[in-house]
């Protein structure tokens, strides 16, 4: 699942991955753009043993896995993946 | 030190069980995920199954499931293949090996493995 | 089932050269793919994972890279402590997969 967070909140990420990791793995993905206090876009990834990485947003992995999940929503599904959240 | 020691191989007739274990010291195995891979004589890894820590989720081999069954024990620290109608080309060296899923999400560390002889 | 295509299945080699492996996935399999090195008589042990990044203690002169289906280890001065047979698997998605393995000898 992926998802879009529009916060308030300065970055959340202090040390990024970029290693690959398996969606069986993987709970969420949670995405936040750039702005409203951080300069950069995040990605965090919410894993089933509870733990988060942040991941690099140039990773290639991410990036490959992103484009699948777009494709694949943008095909299937009347409306896309990203779910936008507004406090 | 991490240590993983497989134990319950042995010489087994064609159609016949075993019970192969796996004791885990030196890491919090109620954290990870297992699995069981085998190595025939001569040949190449072959993955067999793995469960994560809760046990809520199971993957086998599409060729084993339906002889093979994957198991743990958090409580003693164990993992546990349950071998059933057992064929000659079960013939192997059965290893089980961590399934890291914090930092390198590989089969980080293996035991010495145990030896299964299939057989008449 | 994601098929691994390893090759060469064995390779002679001298001390010092430069070793290629490759491994070849029947689909994308992302950046996904790790290394293990294996000794006879001992259980594999894990060199490269996530396609490129070098286990703890591994030596430098091993290396990986990669991504989507071609995959490539390589060993950059080979020493007589090499000599083993080296596995490519995914973890892309299970059933694991391994690739059939590369045994290398000293010429």
């Known amino acids: 699942v992926l998802e879009v967070y529009y916060t308030s909140l300065r970055c959340r990420c202090v040390q990024e991955s970029s290693v690959f990791i398996p969606r069986r793995f993987i709970d969420r993905i949670q995405i936040l753009p750039r702005g409203n206090g951080c300069p950069r876009k995040e990605i965090i990834v919410w894993k089933k043993n509870k733990s988060i990485v942040c991941v690099d947003p140039q990773a290639e992995w991410i990036q490959r896995m992103m484009e699948v999940l777009r494709k694949r929503s943008s095909s299937t599904l009347p409306v896309p993946v990203f779910k936008r959240k507004i406090p | 030190e991490v240590q993983l020691v497989e134990s319950g191989g042995g010489l087994v007739q064609p159609g016949g069980s075993l019970r192969l274990s796996c004791a885990a010291s030196?890491?919090?195995?109620?954290?990870?995920?297992m699995s069981w891979v085998r190595q025939a004589p001569g040949k190449g890894l072959e993955w067999v199954a793995e469960?994560?820590?809760?046990?809520?989720?199971?993957n086998y081999a599409p060729s084993l499931k339906d002889r093979f069954t994957i198991s743990r024990d958090n409580a003693k620290n164990s993992l546990y293949l349950q071998m059933n109608s057992l064929r000659a080309e079960d013939t192997a060296v059965y290893y089980c090996?961590?399934?890291?899923?914090?930092?390198?999400?590989?089969?980080?560390?293996w035991g010495q493995g145990t030896t299964v002889t299939v057989s008449s | 089932d994601i098929q691994m295509t390893q090759s060469p299945s064995s390779l002679s080699a001298s001390v010092g050269d430069r070793v290629t492996i490759t491994c070849k996935a029947s689909q994308d399999v992302n950046t996904g793919v790790y290394w293990y090195q294996q000794k006879p008589g001992k259980a594999p042990k894990l060199l490269i994972y996530?396609?490129?990044y070098r286990y703890t203690g591994v030596p430098s002169r091993f290396s990986g890279s990669g991504s989507g289906t071609d995959f490539t280890f390589t060993i950059s001065s080979l020493q007589p402590e090499d000599i083993a047979t080296y596995y490519c698997q995914q973890g892309y998605s299970t059933p694991l997969t391994f690739g059939g393995g590369t045994k290398l000898e000293i010429k």
């Open positions: 090996a961590r399934q890291e899923d914090y930092e390198y999400y590989a089969l980080d560390y």
């Open positions: 996530s396609a490129s």
């Open positions: 030196g890491i919090d195995f109620s954290r990870y995920w």
């Open positions: 469960i994560n820590p809760e046990s809520s989720t199971i």
